[in-house]
């Protein structure tokens, strides 16, 4: 039960006080008690419940009321059952007794009022009055947890605006309101109560730039909403009529959780006594609601795809045809960024990552815009953000970034359990160097901090700086599976490729050619690849790098060897000993449900079939997956990327609610 104020009573004159329903009010009967008195009794109106703690009754009065010793250890508390119809209509009488003096009476006139700030603390999508039931001042995780949730209003419901909805002080329409969380102030007071009292709604100064609160006028259009709290206004005096009244507020978050902001915002209503104009206003009562800002959540390859993105560039029509066919098979919407908008930047995966935010009443896809800012710089903000599609970015917008700040270097695992700890939304994966050095690359700290601060997909740092491009999607992917953990981790594997090529040579296919059918590309015989000592050394190094990640992933995702599939792949070390795929990198695939768009490797054709394609199909088809090999050689592969790098996917949010987990 909420804490009320302390009321001191004195026999000299009647005391007038306000008691808020649902609060426990302390009654100080000792400090002003007559000197010779040693005990007391209390009588109260039916609407007042008196509770006296400590010690048995000293003596029973004939009237049936008990007397208690006048002792500082005796605690007297009051609660009120109903709101007052008029000021001071509830009475408490204290009678003091002494051995030689007649009883002395002290009178207390109470006004019972109902004041409660309600939000959806039960996370049902509805605001229910919770007076005296739950402590709204704490926010707890888990299925039995409580506490309200706020969305960052980061979409753009007004198509004529270039800004996010949370960047203005206006409520556009009912669409805009739906992105906000409802909070209701319920009051029930005597008619004249607010002539001597005031209500003020406020937020801590440290949180005022993270939230905006609009006050709605009931029964009027949403355009009647006016801002009452926000970056410029930490407090607001409310004009409340007496009697029974409800006031609606709509709350939007302005910032995602981050290093300097844990994501919690407390809104407080304070009741002030303004009856004495000579004195400052006195606080009578406070009620608070704590909100947590919904985190940005990534979706793994195992979530159903809803929309595919790709770029149209010079001569990639065939690639786009393949992606279109795949999207149709997976029943996905397809969005193509035209040449004039991508400015010859085809790397859709690197520019953005599409996740979502969720409150009990609303789920919103949100695009996380990387700071790489090349030709596709404007695409997320101009073409992706919109009505019910949010936007967030982090990191320096001009310079100070590396290749590891592109979002091919940002992936998320499917849900996992690791040594008994559940990650029901999976874990974020990104690449880093294995140790810092003068020229090593790492994901910008601002990005790392943002990802960690979301709390619900605890990040795992992998080692990717050994790659020329340096992205985790160059050596790993996840595909759905019908058994075990519901997925398989795919890892690029030079060892597996050498084993396959050796088997083919042993069967007399040493003359079979890699890159056959590719114009202007020097073809390589299996036997020459197997006999090239330098290439072997390069791939031995690559294997060690991937194996390091393999063990890291097994440990941090709780995987067994049987959860991992090795995809045959060779690499070569180029300048500064950075690795690039020797032939199109098959692990860099587009996963659309059971439909996989895999870079066509142009491997040695044996008995009319590419042995690399055949091997990959034999590994993946038993899982119910359909492999489509896409020719990306000249349009993507030779430009240091593949199918996954050149595409992006919006996926269905998890059915699991993030607030039900315990980070």
């Amino acid at each position: 039960m909420a804490q009320g104020t302390l009321i001191r009573v004195t026999p000299e004159q009647p005391t007038h006080a306000v008691c808020v329903l649902g609060t426990l009010t302390q009654l100080d009967i000792c400090s002003s008690a007559p000197e010779d008195c040693t005990s007391f009794s209390i009588n109260a109106s039916p609407g007042v419940v008196v509770d006296i703690a400590h010690g048995p009754p000293a003596k029973k009065k004939s009237t049936g009321s008990s007397t208690w010793p006048l002792d500082p250890g005796v605690e007297v508390t009051l609660t009120m059952k109903v709101a007052s119809g008029s000021t001071g209509d509830q009475k408490v009488q204290i009678s003091y007794y002494g051995p030689k003096t007649p009883p002395v009476k002290a009178l207390l006139y109470l006004t019972g009022v109902e004041i409660s700030l309600c939000a959806d603390i039960t996370r049902t999508g509805k605001v229910k009055p919770t007076r005296a039931v739950k402590d709204q001042r704490t926010w707890t995780w888990g299925p039995c947890g409580q506490g309200a949730i706020l969305l960052v209003n980061c979409d753009r419901d007004n198509l004529e605006s270039s800004a996010m909805d949370c960047e203005d002080d206006e409520v556009l329409d009912s669409e805009d309101l739906q992105d906000m969380s409802l909070m209701t102030l319920s009051t029930k007071t005597p008619k004249d109560f607010f002539t001597n009292h005031t209500l003020v709604l406020h937020v801590a100064r440290s949180e005022m730039d993270k939230v905006r609160v609009f006050q709605a006028t009931r029964g009027k259009l949403s355009s009647k909403c006016s801002v009452v709290l926000g970056p410029k206004w930490p407090s607001h005096y409310l004009m409340v009529p007496g009697g029974k009244h409800n006031m609606d507020f709509y709350v939007e978050a302005l910032a995602f959780p981050d290093t300097d902001f844990p994501g919690l915002i407390t809104l407080t209503i304070s009741l002030l006594d303004t009856s004495n104009l000579e004195l400052p206003e006195a606080v009578v009562f406070q009620d608070s609601v704590v909100f947590r800002v919904a985190p940005w959540i990534m979706t793994p390859n195992t979530q159903p795809p809803q929309e595919v993105y790709a770029c149209s560039i010079f001569e990639n029509e065939d690639f786009l045809k393949s992606v279109t066919t795949l999207a149709m098979k997976a029943k996905c919407k397809l969005t193509i960024c035209p040449e004039e908008e991508n400015m010859d930047d085809q790397w859709m995966q690197d520019e953005m990552e599409i996740g979502y935010i969720q409150a009990p009443h609303k789920t919103l896809p949100v695009v996380f815009d990387s700071p790489r800012n090349r030709g596709l710089k404007e695409f997320p903000i101009k073409r992706v953000m919109g009505p019910d599609f949010g936007y967030v970015t982090r990191g320096p917008q001009t310079g100070g970034i590396s290749g590891l700040d592109s979002f091919g270097n940002l992936e998320v695992s499917p849900p996992v359990t690791v040594r008994g700890k559940e990650y029901p939304l999976g874990r974020i994966l990104f690449g880093d160097s294995c140790y810092p050095s003068n020229d090593s690359r790492q994901m910008h700290q601002a990005l790392q901090d943002f990802l960690s601060a979301q709390q619900v997909q605890a990040p795992v740092k992998l080692y990717s700086d050994w790659l020329s491009v340096g992205h985790v999607d160059e050596f790993l992917s996840f595909v759905p599976a019908p058994d075990r953990k519901g997925f398989r981790l795919l890892l690029a594997s030079p060892r597996s490729c050498y084993k396959l090529f050796q088997e083919q040579q042993n069967e007399g296919h040493g003359e079979a050619l890699l890159f056959e059918g590719i114009k202007k590309k020097k073809q390589q015989k299996i036997k020459n690849i197997l006999s090239n000592k330098t290439l072997r050394e390069h791939n031995s190094f690559v294997e060690r790098c991937i194996d390091w990640n393999r063990e890291l992933l097994k440990r941090e995702l709780g995987l067994a060897e049987s959860d991992i599939i090795d995809i045959p792949q060779l690499f070569k070390l180029k300048e500064f000993s950075k690795a690039e795929a020797f032939f199109p990198n098959m692990v860099n695939m587009l996963v659309l449900g059971k439909h996989l768009g895999i870079p066509k490797p142009f491997g040695p054709v044996i008995n009319g079939r590419c042995c690399l394609e055949e091997k990959v199909c034999s590994l993946l088809e038993p899982l119910g997956l359909q492999c489509t090999f896409i020719n990306d050689f000249f349009t993507y592969h030779i430009r240091h990327g593949e199918v996954h790098c050149g595409t992006n996917v919006r996926r269905k949010p998890f059915s699991f609610k993030w607030w039900n987990m315990v980070p």
Partner: antibody, heavy 128, light 111 residues
Framework: QVQLVESGGGLVKPGGSLRLSCAAS????????VSWIRQAPGKGLEWVSF????????YYADSVRGRFTISRDNAKNTVYLQMNSLRAEDTAVYYC?????????????????????WGRGTLVTVSS | QSALTQPRSVSGSPGQSVTISCTGT?????????VSWYQQHPGKAPKLIIY???ERPSGVPDRFSGSKSGNTASLTISGLQAEDEADYYC???????????FGGGTKLTVL
């Protein structure tokens, strides 16, 4: 073959900044590694910085690390060298050089470590 | 103080051969086959004449040849001609924190 032209040099006070540009013609610069090399008056060559063709990693000499930034805009066929906190000892002719990344060997040779195409250079003078 | 050591000057008569040495360490010349040589005439930009220790770009006469032994690389110019008079610089990839090193340069005089 690609031709390179440097620009942006000039006189600057110590502590000041300059941005050098290296514009390419005759070929697409996105197929090339690019390095900046400088030569102080009457002195030898000093390697300054490198950016790979994929625009995914960079390297710097100890003498400029933290002050200079190499970047590229493949759409503009240009590589840049942003020079901040300039010192008198940065006075030199700055050359832009490149090597083609389009290699067909099983194992690519070290084309990032040598410079087969050079621009004519641009003079940077740091003096108060 | 250059990281790779070259003689300040060498000279030879037309038709003769000269060799310019370039000494590094186990962390650069000794470790990598990424040694290159450049010719620079006064007031001009350098020109690549040898890469990967001994390979010649197209258009460079076969009078120019490169080799390496241990931590020392060498450039040999046979059948010296007047137009060979120039400064010559060696360069190597390095394990050090500056990944490409140059020598201090050698002035070749054709007598």
């Amino acid at each position: 073959q690609v031709q390179l032209v440097e620009s942006g040099g000039g006189l600057v006070k110590p502590g000041g900044s300059l941005r050098l540009s290296c514009a390419a013609s005759g070929s697409t610069l996105s197929d090339y590694f690019v390095s900046w090399i400088r030569q102080a008056p009457g002195k030898g060559l000093e390697w300054v910085s490198f950016i790979n063709a994929a625009n995914t990693f960079t390297y710097y000499a100890d003498s400029v690390r933290g002050r200079f930034t190499i970047s590229r805009d493949n759409a503009k066929n240009t590589v840049y060298l942003q020079m901040n906190s300039l010192r008198a000892e940065d006075t030199a002719v700055y050359y832009c050089s490149s090597a083609n990344d389009d290699v067909d060997d099983i194992v690519a040779p070290g084309r990032g470590y040598y410079m087969d195409v050079w621009g004519r250079g641009t003079l940077v003078t740091v003096s108060s | 103080q250059s990281a790779l050591t070259q003689p300040r000057s060498v000279s030879g008569s037309p038709g003769q051969s000269v060799t310019i040495s370039c000494t590094g360490t186990r962390g650069d010349v000794g470790r990598y086959n990424h040694v290159s040589w450049y010719q620079q005439h006064p007031g001009k930009a350098p020109k690549l004449i040898i890469y990967n220790v001994y390979e010649r770009p197209s258009g460079v006469p076969d009078r120019f040849s490169g080799s390496k032994s241990g931590n020392t690389a060498s450039l040999t110019i046979s059948g010296l001609q007047a137009e060979d008079e120039a400064d010559y610089y060696c360069s190597s990839h390095s394990r050090s924190s500056t990944p490409v090193l140059f020598g201090g340069g050698t002035k070749l005089t054709v007598l």
